[in-house]
């Protein structure tokens, strides 16, 4: 049997809505023929299901086999190194992969200007892998919230923060002109999920956007 292979040092999930990726770190001194076996356990079934016998990458997209994540008690995954006839012990994820582990994101943020207000519309994620009935708003049906960060250019680090409870929001610009840049981070008040800040969206506000009233 020769020398034992060491186990992958760490195994963990990183996930967004219907984008569930398993990661692991490589064993020390792996050879060109080293690969990794991935197995998955669904809570309630209690038997390990082999997903990949020999992955040469250090991550694996498990979305397709965890589509019921949002209606289940979650999963554990395990990974072991394989090199020819030798294999290591399994390294198991040390937390349960459940809906709570999914990082919340937004699809996009659209901005427009109306009478001195910036009107924002948050588009929710619409991943192709999601079953038709499993929309973001049906899974997270209550207590959706969004932190809004507003930056005025020039003045790179003058931030205003605001929390809103709807996908549509408005920002009063107090008559200021210039470029306003907005980022959004989603959360669900009743949950502990982390949120990822969106990419910045910017819009220019000039005098022409203000209505003159007598």
């Amino acid at each position: 049997h020769g020398t034992e292979l060491p186990s992958p040092p760490s195994v963990w999930f990183e996930a967004e809505f219907f984008h569930h990726i398993l990661h692991w770190t490589p064993i020390p001194n792996q050879s060109e023929s080293t690969c990794y076996e991935v197995a998955l356990l669904r809570y309630g079934i209690e038997s390990w299901n082999s997903i990949s016998n020999c992955s040469q990458t250090l991550s694996y997209d498990l979305t397709a086999v965890t589509l019921d994540l949002y209606h289940s008690n979650g999963y554990r995954a395990r990974v072991r190194a394989v090199d020819g006839s030798r294999h290591s012990n399994w390294t198991v994820t040390n937390t349960r992969f459940s809906v709570d582990e999914v990082t919340l994101t937004v699809g996009s943020v659209n901005l427009e200007i109306h009478n001195g207000f910036i009107l924002g519309k948050i588009q929710l994620p619409r991943p192709k892998m999601a079953p038709a009935n499993d929309t973001y708003e049906s899974i997270f049906s209550h207590f959706r919230e969004y932190e809004i960060a507003i930056r005025k250019v020039p003045g790179n680090f003058t931030f205003t923060h605001k929390k809103v409870k709807h996908e549509n929001f408005s920002l009063l610009t107090s008559g200021e002109v210039g470029e306003f840049c907005v980022q959004v981070k989603p959360s669900v008040a009743s949950r502990s999920n982390k949120g990822m800040w969106s990419k910045e969206e910017c819009i220019s506000l000039t005098r022409q956007y203000f209505t003159v009233t007598n």
């Epitope: 040092p9 990183e14 990661h23 800040w197 990419k199």
Partner: nanobody, 124 residues
Framework: QLQLLESGGGLVQPGGSLRLSCAAS????????MGWFRQAPGKGREFVSA????????YYAESVKGRFTISKDNSKNTLYLQMNSLRAEDTAVYYC?????????????????WGQGTMVTVSS
């Protein structure tokens, strides 16, 4: 907006050492991990090393394994790359990047924010 600022580059002799730093500034820092990439003159950008931001886990390119060490200070939102036993072929612009997608740590596409880069020259 998240901004990444690298420092610590410079001219060093073969066999020497440098420590690169990358400070993440801005009130909207969120990332799965952080990474270092490099681009040698006339070549494409290549992966050097990466680290999970929350939890344990590091990755290294084969060419730097055993010579480079990646580390982080979460309280300062700062990433480091200790580079020892430097070689002429390590000469490149080194970029810090924040991983904003759940995909592979080794892929540029997983990283949504990039620094401007710091030049490392290894020459006698």
């Amino acid at each position: 907006q998240l901004q990444l600022l690298e420092s610590g580059g410079g001219l060093v002799q073969p066999g020497g050492s440098l420590r690169l730093s990358c400070a993440a500034s801005g009130r909207t820092f969120s990332a799965y991990g952080m990474g270092w990439f490099r681009q040698a003159p006339g070549k494409g950008r290549e992966f050097v090393s990466a680290i999970r931001w929350y939890g344990e886990g590091t990755y290294y390119a084969e060419s730097v394994k055993g010579r480079f060490t990646i580390s982080k200070d979460n309280s300062k939102n700062t990433l480091y790359l200790q580079m020892n036993s430097l070689r002429a072929e390590d000469t490149a612009v080194y970029y810090c990047a924040a991983k904003t997608r759940p995909d592979s740590y080794l892929s540029e596409k997983s990283y949504g924010y990039w620094g401007q880069g710091t030049m490392v020259t290894v020459s006698s």
